[in-house]
């Protein structure tokens, strides 16, 4: 007959799960902030830099109050997957100038990957509908010049910083509502 069934698996406290996700997001925000500052020190940015392939920022001012957990997690996961892809591209195709940002870029990539896994786990623990697998994204074209790679790095780190700041705000507020 086999061993007797174990005790029913207790579902983890969603607040605790969300809490550890917030902390991981804040930790990644700190890393991104530090790396963006390092990039600015080495290659000062003249104004804002944009990259068309980056996700648009997930929210406008005043929209925080209307946030719902499934929407935040789904959107955050999609945006972070895009940033992960861009960081991988930057490390591969960014040119020799950006080699000076290693090993920090590698660490950032690993921590971004860890946060994505944590979000996936949180979504399954909260029994949220899993998003369909992402369609294969078109490959990112290599930067046209060394300076193009640096401009792309400014855009990627700046965008990631704002996305994570937005995520921390949203997750902190949602945690108080749980």
């Amino acid at each position: 007959p086999g061993p007797p069934p174990g005790p029913p698996r207790v579902s983890p406290d969603p607040r605790a799960e969300l809490d550890s996700t917030v902390l991981l997001t804040r930790s990644l925000l700190a890393d991104t902030r530090q790396l963006a500052a390092q990039l600015r020190d080495k290659f000062p940015a003249d104004g804002d830099h944009n990259l068309d392939s980056l996700p648009t920022l997930a929210m406008s001012a005043g929209a925080l109050g209307a946030l719902q957990l499934p929407g935040v997690l789904t959107r955050l996961r999609a945006d972070l997957l895009s940033y992960l892809r861009h960081v991988q591209w930057l490390r591969r195709a960014g040119g020799s100038s950006l080699k000076t940002l290693e090993p920090e870029l590698g660490t950032l990539q690993a921590r971004l990957d860890r946060l994505l896994r944590r979000l996936q786990l949180l979504m399954s623990r909260l029994a949220l509908p899993q998003p369909p697998p992402d369609p294969p994204a078109p490959p990112l074209a290599p930067p046209s010049s060394a300076w193009g790679g640096i401009r792309a790095a400014h855009a990627i780190l700046g965008g990631l910083h704002l996305t994570l700041d937005w995520a921390v705000r949203g997750l902190l507020l949602l945690k108080t509502r749980l």
């Epitope: 550890s20 991981l24 930790s27 001012a61 005043g62 925080l64 700041d165 937005w166 108080t176």
Partner: antibody
Framework: EVQLVQSGAEVKKPGASVKISCKAS????????MDWVKQAPGQRLEWIGD????????IYNQKFTGRATLTVDKSASTAYMELSSLRSEDTAVYYC????????????WGQGTTVTVSS | DIVLTQSPASLALSPGERATLSCRAS??????????IHWYQQKPGQAPRLLIY???NLESGVPARFSGSGSGTDFTLTISSLEEEDFATYYC?????????FGQGTKLEIK
């Protein structure tokens, strides 16, 4: 020199509103969030809220939600806090302070704005 | 909300003495490699000034006689040898969660 300069003292009647400004200089305004802190006489410091200059999206201490409104004017590197439906307990010094959400400490403070609520 | 309790409420010491100020949190404020406690100094009529961030990191421009330690729920600010300008009120602040809160302060007075 990194500086936050706040608007001057205000005297208001109960039920009125007050709007305090905080002008930032000496750093890139969009690189840090702006937080607001209340210090009432004989009370501990109390965090009111935080705003990101690029995306707006303020978050508030629940105690102040609905009465405090944080805004920014990026072009003027200035943050604002408006407090409505004033009552005597709102008599305090209000500070703006530079912060960020990763570690959330306040490394640069304004000089403070005294708000007195009295009939 | 996390409540921070500072002790003692006031402390009278002489210049040259060592000061030890305590801050206790109602729940742990340490996690993911960080202790989310920060210390400030405030003098009458002035804004608070950051001294120590993340429990033990000395803010730029702050004299090395200031140091911070602790983890979990118990934290300490130490001033190794008091100078005249150190007599002020000291506050701890946590940033572990929303909302960040402050302790009630420890007033350091000249004996």
């Amino acid at each position: 020199e990194v500086q936050l300069v706040q608007s001057g003292a205000e005297v208001k009647k109960p039920g009125a509103s007050v709007k305090i400004s905080c002008k930032a200089s000496g750093y890139i305004f969009r690189d840090y969030n702006m937080d607001w802190v209340k210090q009432a006489p004989g009370q501990r410091l109390e965090w009111i809220g935080d705003i990101n200059p690029t995306i707006g999206a303020p978050i508030y201490n629940q105690k102040f939600t609905g009465r405090a409104t944080l805004t920014v004017d990026k072009s003027a590197s200035t943050a604002y806090m408006e407090l409505s439906s004033l009552r005597s307990e709102d008599t305090a010094v209000y500070y703006c302070a530079r912060g960020e959400l990763a570690h959330w400490y306040f490394d640069v403070w304004g000089q403070g704005t005294t708000v007195t609520v009295s009939s | 909300d996390i409540v921070l309790t500072q002790s003692p409420a006031s402390l009278a010491l002489s210049p040259g003495e060592r000061a030890t100020l305590s801050c206790r949190a109602s729940k742990s404020v340490s996690t993911e490699g960080y202790s989310y406690i920060h210390w400030y100094q405030q003098k009458p009529g002035q804004a608070p000034r950051l001294l120590i961030y993340l429990a033990s990191n000395l803010e730029s421009g702050v004299p090395a006689r200031f140091s911070g330690s602790g983890s979990g729920t118990d934290f300490t600010l130490t001033i190794s040898s008091l100078e005249e300008e150190d007599f002020a009120t000291y506050y701890c602040q946590h940033s572990r969660d929303l909302p960040p809160t402050f302790g009630q302060g420890t007033k350091l007075e000249i004996k």
